[in-house]
Interface confidence: low
């Protein structure tokens, strides 16, 4: 389980055309459910139940986004429509170039994602928890345009990170 280095860039613009960018860094883990690859794309927040919808006409995004899914406590969803791995697959099928799971409230998901799979996804499936997950969700919940870069090694040059 290798470390995934995640850089998130938040882009804010004003009506006057000015803009400011904020960058923050966090770390997660590449799970065995996916590939240990670098990936990059605009963040799309997905509700776990939103991935249950099997209608291919709905919720399709252009290829290349990074799906962020905050998993809920297992008690809140005792009979999930899909396993965590199934949700990752569904996101990739819909065009995600990577999936990041916040497993803070469902640590059991880590084992599910790391169970040996005969057919792992060809895109990275990363999980975050604790302070890193809080950082990520704080950004995602701002509902502003944000972009994630996932790398399997630290950035070649140190990036200035700013907590959101």
């Amino acid at each position: 389980k290798e470390t995934a280095f995640v850089e998130v860039v938040l882009f804010e613009s004003s009506p006057s055309g000015d803009y400011t960018t904020y960058t923050t860094g966090l770390t997660g883990r590449f799970s065995r459910a996916g590939a240990t690859l670098s990936a990059e794309g605009e963040i799309v927040q997905m509700h776990p139940l939103g991935l249950c919808n099997n209608n291919d006409e709905e919720d399709l995004y252009e290829y290349g986004w990074v799906g962020v899914v905050k998993l809920e406590q297992p008690e809140l969803d005792p009979k999930p429509c899909l396993t965590v791995l199934g949700k990752a697959k569904r996101a990739v099928q819909r065009g995600a170039t990577a999936v990041i799971f916040d497993v803070s409230e469902n640590p059991e998901a880590i084992d599910q994602l790391n169970q040996g799979s005969e057919d792992p996804l060809k895109r990275p499936v990363v999980y975050v928890k604790g302070a890193d997950a809080i950082k990520l969700m704080n950004i995602v919940n701002k509902q502003k345009v944000a972009r994630a870069r996932i790398q399997h090694r630290p950035p070649r040059q140190p990036t200035e990170y700013f907590d959101m």
Epitope: S16, Y19, T21, A39, E40, G64, T97, R149, R156, E160
Partner: antibody, heavy 121, light 108 residues
Framework: EVQLVESGGGLVKPGGSLRLSCAAS????????MSWVRQAPGKGLEWVGF??????????EYAASVKGRFTISRDDSKNTLYLQMNSLKTEDTAVYYC????????????WGQGTLVTVSS | DIELTQPPSVSVSPGQTASITCSGD??????VHWYQQKPGQAPVLVIY???QRPSGIPERFSGSNSGNTATLTISGTQAEDEADYYC???????????FGGGTKLTVL
Amino acid sequence: EVQLVESGGGLVKPGGSLRLSCAASGFTFSNAWMSWVRQAPGKGLEWVGFTKNEVGGYTTEYAASVKGRFTISRDDSKNTLYLQMNSLKTEDTAVYYCARAIYYLEAFDVWGQGTLVTVSS
Amino acid sequence: DIELTQPPSVSVSPGQTASITCSGDSLGSYYVHWYQQKPGQAPVLVIYRNKQRPSGIPERFSGSNSGNTATLTISGTQAEDEADYYCQTYDWMYSSRVFGGGTKLTVL
């Protein structure tokens, strides 16, 4: 009107130094990530480097071809971007453009008119 | 770093559709931007983030990007569109901005 105006170009001998300036107006310069891009005569565009804004810690990054020789700096109080070029080589001969970088620091939406730097003995 | 390859030249008749390609390894995983440069002038951004058009750019300019190829399409090409066109991306693996070699569009 959003505008960038470069100055400081000219003729310099190999091994010499030159400092280019880029005066910005019409937008909040201190928020912007700024870049230098060059174009050798009759050739294509080549990214030189950029500087982040204050929020980004004024971090700079450079193309491999100029790293260690060129330095980008900025003076937000003067709305001015600089490019200090040392140990110049004949292959550095080009029109140098300053540009504002947006959309996750990838695309350049505002360009200056460029200033010609000629490195020749 | 990723390398972007463009055809050196493309010719088109007025009113026809011009397509300029830009190829690179897994380019569809990156955002691609396109610039128009006329002789003696600075480049102008005509398409950003694969297919977005900045304000002031005519609707006849459009872009797409998938697989290993990004394409700039100019429908109903006009004489004033004759220029050099450059694709560009941000190589986030190496923190560098990369330009293609440029394509000279000739309107016959």
